[in-house]
């Protein structure tokens, strides 16, 4: 199957990478991390057509049996393919550390 | 936050492993797999609420935005975390051959 | 053009206080954090410490900590690395740089600030 | 504190040549590593961030792999301007530390 890019739904509706700007407080994080204060969130949102960004051979089983039991079998989803890391600034028993997080930011999308 | 595996909306509704029973020609394969004829297909099937299953702090991230801006942040979904390895007895030029595909039966499931 | 630009080479005598500046622009200084450097003759690098310029936090390398003192002033996009009393050891070449927290790198360096320390 | 090891800490090589430099972590860093390249005189230039993701404005000949605790650095033909010292550098957690560099010289 291809593992097509072009969105048969129109520009902008299909599996892609989004930001969404969020605070502390947004991401539930205001009691123990310091910084940064604001994040800008990659993730990755969007419809799952028929052989668009297909991660592997089992969304292909998957959007098949979708359309053959649309009330048993879901759609493809939309999910991160791999990630940004990102470090933050957070609070410890002692004072403050850095801590790096390689699974928070999403780099590029498919669906699964 | 919890990696909780205790589903709030009751039992067998939230994410987890299902099997589905396939012929070929449901998978779309009838015209270059012989054998096996029917696979039992496992994949990830429910809904992720809050903590259910979070595979990683991006899960994290998306189900608090979910809550915020639920009409632009779409709940976390449930997508495999591994996968089975599956043996296909397929159709080549020169007759048959087996191929090993690692990414076709979903193995366990998480919530991203 | 983004730059960090540090200020020139000092030379002191052991128990002097000294403060050396890196100053940004072409960015907003806020986005980012600021690391120091060091790297002592013929040697290699050596992570001291970093700060949050927006809301002042400082995390040093245990090995710095008590030593020297990173600090900030926003309103003019500057970085400061002071001594309250030198020493010979203090001898190096120290670099400021931008850290990117998305991604997690050094991604725009000064040019370096010489400190010699020497009776 | 998390021990970065470099090797070799110096090698020799021509122009053409393929080169690798490998880091070890005294523990697990995930992919939290980043590559520099010093040349004397000069700040030290971010090559590869991520354990394997090459900085924008850096010849795709520099790659980086690994994961955990053992990482490679490999410079699939050695050019000129490549002759410098490398440097890994783990941001795992606080504190930060640099690996003591690998010097590549001309054979």
């Known amino acids: 199957a291809r593992n097509g890019d072009r969105c048969p739904l129109g520009p902008g509706r299909c599996c892609r990478l989004h930001t969404v700007h969020a605070s502390l407080e947004d991401l539930g994080w205001a009691d123990w991390v310091l910084s940064p204060r604001e994040v800008q969130v990659t993730m990755c949102i969007g419809a799952c057509p028929s052989q668009f960004r297909e991660a592997n051979m089992h969304a292909q089983i998957k959007m098949n049996l979708h359309r053959l039991k649309p009330d048993t079998v879901p759609a493809p989803c939309c999910v991160p393919a791999s990630y940004n890391p990102m470090v933050l600034i957070q609070k410890t028993d002692t004072g403050v550390s850095l801590q790096t997080y390689d699974d928070l930011l999403a780099k590029d999308c498919h669906c699964v | 936050a919890r990696n909780g595996d205790r589903c709030p909306l009751g039992p067998g509704r939230c994410c987890r492993l299902h099997t589905v029973h396939a012929s070929l020609e449901d998978l779309g394969w009838a015209d270059w797999v012989l054998s096996p004829r029917e696979v039992q297909v496992t994949m990830c099937i429910g809904a992720c609420p809050s903590q259910f299953r979070e595979a990683n702090m991006h899960a994290q991230i998306k189900m608090n935005l979910h809550r915020l801006k639920p009409d632009t942040v779409p709940a976390p979904c449930c997508v495999p975390a591994s996968y089975n390895p599956m043996v296909l007895i397929q159709k080549t030029d020169t007759g048959v051959s087996l191929q090993t595909y690692d990414d076709l039966l979903a193995k366990d499931c998480h919530c991203v | 053009e983004v730059q960090l630009v540090q200020s020139g080479a000092e030379v002191k005598k052991p128990g002097e206080s000294l403060k050396i500046s890196c100053k940004g622009s072409?960015?907003?200084?806020?986005?980012?954090?600021i690391s120091w450097v060091r790297q002592m003759p013929g040697k290699g690098l050596e992570w001291m410490g970093i700060?949050?310029?927006?809301?002042?936090?400082?995390i040093y390398s245990p090995s710095f900590q008590g030593q020297v003192t990173i600090s900030a002033d926003k309103s003019i996009s500057t970085a400061y690395l002071q001594w309250s009393s030198l020493k010979a050891s203090d001898t190096a070449m120290y670099y400021c740089?931008?850290?990117?927290?998305?991604?997690?790198?050094?991604?725009?360096w000064g040019q370096g600030t010489l400190v010699t320390v020497s009776s | 504190d998390i021990q970065m090891t470099q090797s070799p800490s110096s090698l020799s090589a021509s122009v053409g040549d393929r080169v690798t430099i490998t880091c070890r972590a005294s523990q697990s860093i995930s992919n939290n590593l980043n590559w520099y390249q010093q040349k004397p005189g000069k700040a030290p230039k971010l090559l590869i961030y991520a354990a394997s993701n090459l900085q924008s404005g850096v010849p795709s000949r520099f790659s980086g792999s690994g994961s955990g605790t053992d990482f490679t650095l490999t410079i699939s033909s050695l050019q000129p301007e490549d002759f410098a010292t490398y440097y890994c550098?783990?941001?795992?957690?606080?504190?930060?530390?640099f690996g003591q560099g690998t010097k590549v010289e001309i054979k």
């Open positions: 740089a931008r850290v990117s927290y998305y991604g997690g790198y050094f991604d725009i």
């Open positions: 072409g960015y907003s200084f806020t986005d980012y954090w």
């Open positions: 700060i949050d310029p927006s809301g002042s936090y400082t």
């Open positions: 550098f783990q941001l795992d957690h606080s504190p930060f530390t």
